[in-house]
C-alpha cells in the first residue's frame, strides 16, 4: 500500500492564539458612540463619543480635534455654549445617545442625555484628507418646546436610534427612543417619530408625526431599539420588547418595524415579529419541534450578499439581507445549545410578508378576529377597522393606520450552533469577492471573521483574534472606513482590515494557500504571510 501524507486535522492547521496588533485609539473613557465619514474627495474621519467629549480622528486614528459636550452647565461645555447663555436645564454629565451623519449637508449630529435630549449639528469642514467640525449649531428653539410637545427633544437617556434620510430639500430624522414614565413626563422624546430638520438649523419643525407607548403601558411595557437602517423605500427599526401587553413583561421577542423613507408619515407603519431558532441536525429528546427559540436580538446589520450565500438563501446575488445575532434571553446566559445564533432575513422577503399581512387585514374577506395589534401604541381594534373604531368610515382607508402583521418570519441559525459558547456582541457583514463575511465582536474582546455559509459542520474562519489584553466586551456599533472596520471595546477604538489582520494564524502551507484570495496569503519560508511581510520568497501557487 502506498504511503500517504498524514492528514492534518482542520483545527490543527490554525492557531487563534497568534497575536495581531491593529491600529487603535485610546478615547479616555468608555466609548459611547462612533461613526465614520468618507467624503467625495478622499477626505475621511472617525467620530468617537465618550462621556462629555467628542473626538474627531483622521483615517489613521490620530486625533484631529476634540470637543467638550458636557457636563451641561459647565462653562467648559463647547456644545452647550451654542445654545446661548444658560441655564438650559439641570446640570449633569452628557452621555452621547445619538451620533449620526446627515449626508445631505454633510454634517455630524450628536444628541446627548442632558439638556432634554437636544441635538447639536456640526458642519463638516474638509482640510486635505482630514475633516474638522465647524462650530456647533444648537438644534433647540426654546419657544417651540414644551414638556408635552417638544420637537427638539430627540434623545432618551434610555437609548435612541436615529436614521437620517434626505427628502427634497430637507433631512428627515427617523427617531426611535426607549421610554419609561419618568422620561415620557419630562420633554417626552416619543417612541417613534419622523422629524424634519429646519433649514436654518435652529431645531426640528413642529407638528412632527409620532407614535408613543400609551401612558397606561409605560411602566410595564419597555421597548429597546437595537438597530436602525435605511434601504430602498423604507427605514427599519429592530426592537426587543415584551411579546404581549397583557402577559409577562419578561417574555421578550424581536420585531422589525418598517416606515416609509419617501413619505414622512406614520400611517403605513408596520411591525413584523422575527423568529430565530437553533435547529440541530439531530434533535435531542425533549427539544422543541421546529428548533429552540432564540427570541432576543442582540445585534444586527444589513448588507448585500455574495453569490454563494445568495444561492443558499434562494435569492439573487447582491440582494440586501438583514443579519441578526440572537440569544435566548436578556442576560444571554447559557442554556441548551449555543449562546448566540445568527439568522438571515432577506429584505425583499420581509417586505413581501408585511405586504401580505396588510392584504389580510384590509382586503375582504377579512378573517374574523384578526387584530390590528400594536395595542401599546394605539387603541385596540379588529381589521379592517382603524384603531379604536368599530368600523371604517367611507373616507378612511384601512391601510393608513399602523399595523402588526399577524404572521412571524422564522429562520434558523446559519451557523448550525457552531458558535457554541461564544457570546457575540457586535456584528458587521461585508461581501468580499463572492464571499459573505460576518465580522463579529465578542463578550471577551475578540474579533471573529467568519464566512457566512450554512451547509458546513465547521466554521470557515478568516480570523479569530483578541483585540487587546483588556478582554472587555466589543460594543454593539461597528463602522466601516474604506477597507477597515472600526470596533470599540472599553475605552479603545480598533481598526480591523475587512480582509483580516493577517495570515500568521494559518499554520500549514496547505491551509495557507487555501485561504480566500482576498486575504492575500502566501507561504513565506516557514510561515503564512502577506507579501509585504515577506522579504524573501513568497509563494501563492504551490507548497514546498
Amino acid at each position: 500500500e502506498d504511503w500517504q501524507c498524514p492528514r492534518t486535522p482542520y483545527a490543527a492547521s490554525r492557531d487563534f492564539d497568534v497575536k495581531y496588533v491593529v491600529p487603535s485609539f485610546s478615547a479616555g473613557g468608555l466609548v459611547q458612540a462612533m461613526v465614520t465619514y468618507e467624503g467625495d474627495r478622499n477626505e475621511s474621519a472617525v467620530f468617537v463619543a465618550i462621556r462629555n467629549r467628542l473626538h474627531v480622528l483622521g483615517p489613521d486614528l490620530k486625533s484631529v480635534q476634540s470637543l467638550a459636550t458636557g457636563p451641561a452647565g459647565d462653562p467648559g461645555c463647547q456644545t452647550c455654549a451654542a445654545c446661548g447663555p444658560g441655564p438650559h436645564g439641570p446640570p449633569g454629565d452628557t452621555d452621547t445617545k445619538v451620533l449620526v451623519l446627515d449626508p445631505a449637508l454633510p454634517a455630524l449630529v450628536s444628541c446627548g442625555s442632558s439638556l432634554q435630549g437636544r441635538c447639536f449639528l456640526h458642519d463638516l469642514e474638509p482640510q486635505g484628507t482630514a475633516v474638522h467640525l465647524a462650530a456647533p449649531a444648537c438644534l433647540f428653539s426654546a419657544h417651540h418646546n414644551r414638556p408635552d410637545d417638544c420637537p427638539d427633544c430627540v434623545a432618551s437617556p434610555l437609548g435612541t436610534r436615529v436614521t437620517v434620510v434626505e427628502q427634497g430639500q430637507a433631512s428627515y430624522f427617523y427617531v426611535a427612543s426607549s421610554l419609561d414614565a419618568a422620561v415620557a413626563a419630562s420633554f417626552s422624546p416619543r417612541s417613534v417619530s419622523i422629524r424634519r430638520l429646519k433649514a436654518d438649523a435652529s431645531g426640528f419643525a413642529p407638528g412632527f408625526v409620532a407614535l408613543s407607548v400609551l401612558p397606561k403601558h409605560l411602566v410595564s411595557y419597555s421597548i429597546e431599539y437595537v438597530h436602525s437602517f435605511h434601504t430602498g423605500a423604507f427605514v427599519y427599526f429592530l426592537t426587543v420588547q415584551p411579546a404581549s401587553v397583557t402577559d409577562d413583561p419578561s417574555a421578550l421577542h424581536t420585531r422589525l418595524a418598517r416606515l416609509s423613507a419617501t413619505e414622512p408619515e406614520l400611517g403605513d407603519y408596520r411591525e413584523l415579529v422575527l423568529d430565530c431558532r437553533f435547529a440541530p441536525k439531530r434533535r435531542r429528546r425533549g427539544a422543541p419541534e421546529g428548533g429552540q427559540p432564540y427570541p432576543v436580538l442582540r445585534v444586527a446589520h444589513s448588507a448585500p450578499v455574495g453569490a454563494q450565500l445568495a444561492t443558499e438563501l434562494s435569492i439573487a446575488e447582491g440582494q440586501e439581507v438583514l443579519f441578526g445575532v440572537f440569544v435566548t434571553g436578556k442576560d444571554g446566559g447559557p442554556g441548551v445549545g449555543p449562546n448566540s445564533v445568527v439568522c438571515a432575513f432577506p429584505i425583499d422577503l420581509l417586505d413581501t410578508l408585511i405586504d401580505e399581512g396588510v392584504e389580510r387585514c384590509c382586503e375582504s374577506p377579512v378573517h374574523p378576529g384578526l387584530r390590528r395589534g400594536l395595542d401599546f401604541f394605539q387603541s385596540p381594534s379588529f381589521c379592517p377597522n382603524p384603531p379604536g373604531l368599530e368600523a371604517l368610515s367611507p373616507n378612511t382607508s384601512c391601510r393608513h393606520f399602523p399595523l402588526l402583521v399577524s404572521s412571524s418570519f422564522s429562520r434558523v441559525d446559519l451557523f448550525n450552533g457552531l458558535l457554541g459558547p461564544v457570546q457575540v456582541t457586535a456584528l458587521y457583514v461585508t461581501r468580499l469577492d463572492n464571499v459573505t463575511v460576518a465580522h463579529m465582536g465578542t463578550m471577551d474582546g475578540r474579533i471573529l471573521q467568519v464566512e457566512l455559509v450554512r451547509s458546513l459542520n465547521y466554521l470557515l474562519y478568516v480570523s479569530n483574534f483578541s483585540l487587546g489584553d483588556s478582554g472587555q466586551p466589543v460594543q454593539r456599533d461597528v463602522s466601516r472606513l474604506g477597507d477597515h472596520l472600526l470596533f470599540a471595546s472599553g475605552d479603545q477604538v480598533f481598526q480591523v482590515p475587512i480582509q483580516g489582520p493577517g495570515c500568521r494564524h494559518f499554520l500549514t502551507c496547505g491551509r495557507c494557500l487555501r485561504a480566500w484570495h482576498f486575504m492575500g496569503c502566501g507561504w513565506c519560508g516557514n510561515m503564512c504571510g502577506q507579501q509585504k511581510e515577506c522579504p524573501g520568497s513568497w509563494q501563492q501557487d504551490h507548497c514546498p
Epitope: 445631505a104 427628502q167 427634497g168 430639500q169 419617501t262
Partner: antibody, heavy 121, light 107 residues
Framework: QIQLQQSGPELVKPGTSVKISCKAS????????MNWVRQKPGQGLEWIGR????????RYNEKFRDKAILTVDTSSSTAYMQLSSLTSEDTAVYFC??????????????WGQGTSVTVSL | DIQMTQSPASQSASLGESVTITCLAS??????LAWYQQKPGKSPQLLIY???SLADGVPSRFSASGSGTKFSFKIDSLQSEDFVSYYC?????????FGGGTKLEIK
Amino acid sequence: QIQLQQSGPELVKPGTSVKISCKASDYTLTDFYMNWVRQKPGQGLEWIGRIYPGTDKTRYNEKFRDKAILTVDTSSSTAYMQLSSLTSEDTAVYFCARSAYYGNYVAMDYWGQGTSVTVSL
Amino acid sequence: DIQMTQSPASQSASLGESVTITCLASQTIGTWLAWYQQKPGKSPQLLIYAATSLADGVPSRFSASGSGTKFSFKIDSLQSEDFVSYYCQQLYNTPWTFGGGTKLEIK
C-alpha cells in the same frame, strides 16, 4: 407678483470667470432655497446646486463643485452664481429658480428668465 | 445619483389628441417628482408637483400619475400652445436630476 430677474447675456473669454445675478421680488429671499440650473444649447436641464439664503448654506451637484460658487446678498434680495475657469463647454443658459414646499413636497415654482453665457475667443 | 429616463424623446400628435410621456427613476423616489413645460427661448414652468398634483393656474387637461419608480404625464385634447418641451425632475435626493426631455411636435 413673484419675480426672479436675472442679469443680461455674457460673452466671455476662455479661462476667465463670470458672475451672474438673480434678483428676487415680492417674497422674502431668506425664506426659500434658491437653485441654479444649466441648459446647454439644444439640450436638457441640469441642476447645479442650491443655497439657503437664511444661512448661506450651499449644496452642490458634485459635477459643478469646482465650477460654481453660490452666494446671496440679502440686503438687495439678490442671489449670485460665479462660474470660473470657463471653457466652451460652459456655454449655456443658466436659470435661477426658487424651490418651495407644497405640503410635504418640494418643487421649483418660480424661475428667472435665464442668463445666456457664451464662452468664445 | 438617481437617473431619470424620460420617453419618448420626441412625439408627433395632432390637435385634440391625447399624449402620454413616461419617466422612470433608477431607484424609488416615492412621489418626489415634478413635471415642467418649457417653451422655446423661455424658462421652464411648473405644471405638476408631488407626482400628481396640479400647480396653480395649470389647465385641467394636464394630469399625471405614478409613484416609486414609474411615472406618467398626460395631456388630453392637445392645443397648439402645448407643442413644446416637457421635463420630469426628481427632488427626492440631491443632486436633483431631470429627465432628458420630450419635444411634442404637431403632426
